[in-house]
């Protein structure tokens, strides 16, 4: 929802968290603001305190329940409001009717581990975290490998077009240190975006055997 120079963007992690960012040019840094969530068909509502993340933007997480509980469904609509205190009163600064499963951003994949490493290849696995059972197998992943002397931005993206929680990296250099990251995205949702990148997994390929042609 955009009002003039105000921007209010929220994402649902598919289970029990809605993360919101509100930016407003010229807003007072010390103003107390909150996000209020009112589902259309639920008995609960939730509030979180907006905290500054930059000069003109604030963020907060609406914790709807325990991390793996399915707190919203595909047919829920949540009214989200930014409310700021003005003296003794609260003023509404932004509002949106939020369809959770059209605005998804999952948690970063976790539990990255090296399953098997050789001189030229490495098999890596991971797990998805707090992802709804709704998605079945309809998720996609992007992965990238950091090679020596390069930046993450230079790393080519590898796309896995199905729910495949492992990858076999090929054509690696022996006895070389690498890092690996992966992110996930459901197919569902018009405004759905990629999860954050996972924590990097560092690994080293095995040295080439002496006297052998590699």
């Amino acid at each position: 929802a955009v009002n003039g120079t105000s921007r209010f963007t929220c994402f649902y992690n598919s289970r029990a968290n809605i993360s919101c960012v509100w930016s407003q040019d010229g807003a007072l840094q010390d103003t107390s603001c909150q996000v209020h969530a009112w589902p259309d068909r639920r008995r609960w509502n939730q509030t979180c305190e907006l905290l500054p993340v930059s000069q003109a933007s604030w963020a907060c997480n609406l914790i709807l329940g325990t991390p793996d509980s399915q707190k919203l469904t595909a047919v829920d609509i949540v009214t989200l409001r930014v409310m700021c205190r003005e003296g003794v009163r609260w003023r509404m600064m932004a509002i949106q009717d939020f369809k959770p499963f059209e605005n998804l951003r999952l948690m970063a994949p976790i539990s990255l581990q090296v399953v098997h490493v050789e001189t030229h290849r490495c098999n890596i696995s991971w797990k998805i975290s707090q992802a709804s059972h709704y998605f079945e197998r309809h998720l996609e992943f992007e992965a990238r490998t950091l090679s020596p002397g390069h930046t993450w931005e230079e790393a080519p993206l590898m796309t896995l077009k199905q729910k495949q929680e492992w990858i076999c990296l090929e054509t690696l250099t022996p006895d070389t240190q690498y890092e690996f990251q992966v992110r996930v995205k459901p197919l569902q949702g018009e405004f759905t975006t990629w999860s954050p990148w996972s924590q990097p997994l560092a690994f080293r390929t095995k040295p080439a055997a002496l006297g052998k042609d590699t």
Epitope: Q70, T73, A74, V75, F101, E102, H133, Y134, F135, E136, H138, L187, Q188, E190
Partner: antibody, heavy 117, light 107 residues
């Protein structure tokens, strides 16, 4: 292999109630959604509702919610659809299906219900 | 309730030729459109999700596309087993609704 096996054909009188079962195998029933869809002659496919076995919630289409009840028995991996106050236009094939909320990935073989006096 | 309109109601095509089936939504549904195939006496089978994503195990000759509220299912080279009824279904607004179907028959 994912399988949904439905109970057999039913003949009912107007005003009666029918209860159809859908026994599933090949996937985790406790973490699934089971949908029910009606296919009446000349009316095409109509989505009736679903049960979310993990969240323990049901969702019904407005056109059916007064007369339909969807339940599940997680001890036997079986879902049920009960349709009450039957009328002639309820004569149809009824399907159970597994899917997320948005589309139906696997279907049962269908159960024919005939409503006739 | 969103109305899904499929056209034509019946399409006659020769084996080996291309078939193009259309589905139009009565309002904007983003890419929340899914295609099914149904053969006589059988349950529907999911072919394509979100307008253009093929389901694993579905032959590559089936493809989907979208232009605004109009969605197209294309079968590039018809095989004998492709003659069936095809349904579209929207999942943008509750309740989810199906088109009335297009019957694809042998010419």
């Amino acid at each position: 292999e994912v399988q949904l096996v439905q109970s057999g054909a039913e003949v009912k009188k107007p005003g009666a109630t029918v209860k159809i079962s859908c026994k599933v195998s090949g996937f985790n029933f406790k973490e699934s959604l089971i949908h029910w869809v009606q296919q009446a002659p000349g009316k095409g496919l109509e989505w009736m509702g679903w049960i979310d076995n993990e969240a323990g919630e049901t969702e019904y289409a407005p056109g059916f919610q007064d007369r339909v009840t969807i339940t599940a028995d997680t001890s036997t991996d079986t879902a049920y659809m009960e349709l009450s106050s039957l009328r002639s236009e309820d004569t149809a094939v009824y399907y159970c299906a597994r899917g997320g909320p948005w589309f139906l990935s696997y279907w049962g073989q269908g159960t024919t219900v005939t409503v006739s006096s | 309730e969103i109305v899904m309109t499929q056209s034509p109601a019946t399409l006659s095509v020769s084996p080996g030729e291309r078939a193009t089936l259309s589905c139009r939504a009565s309002q904007i549904i983003s890419n929340n459109l899914h295609w099914y195939q149904q053969k006589p006496g059988q349950a529907p089978r999911l072919l394509i999700i979100y307008g253009l994503q093929s389901i694993s195990g579905i032959p590559a000759r089936f493809s989907g596309s979208r232009s605004g509220t109009e969605f197209t299912l294309t079968i590039s080279s018809l095989q004998s087993e492709d003659f069936a009824v095809y349904f579209c279904q929207q999942s943008n607004n509750f309740p989810y609704t199906f088109g009335q179907g297009t019957k694809l028959e042998i010419k």
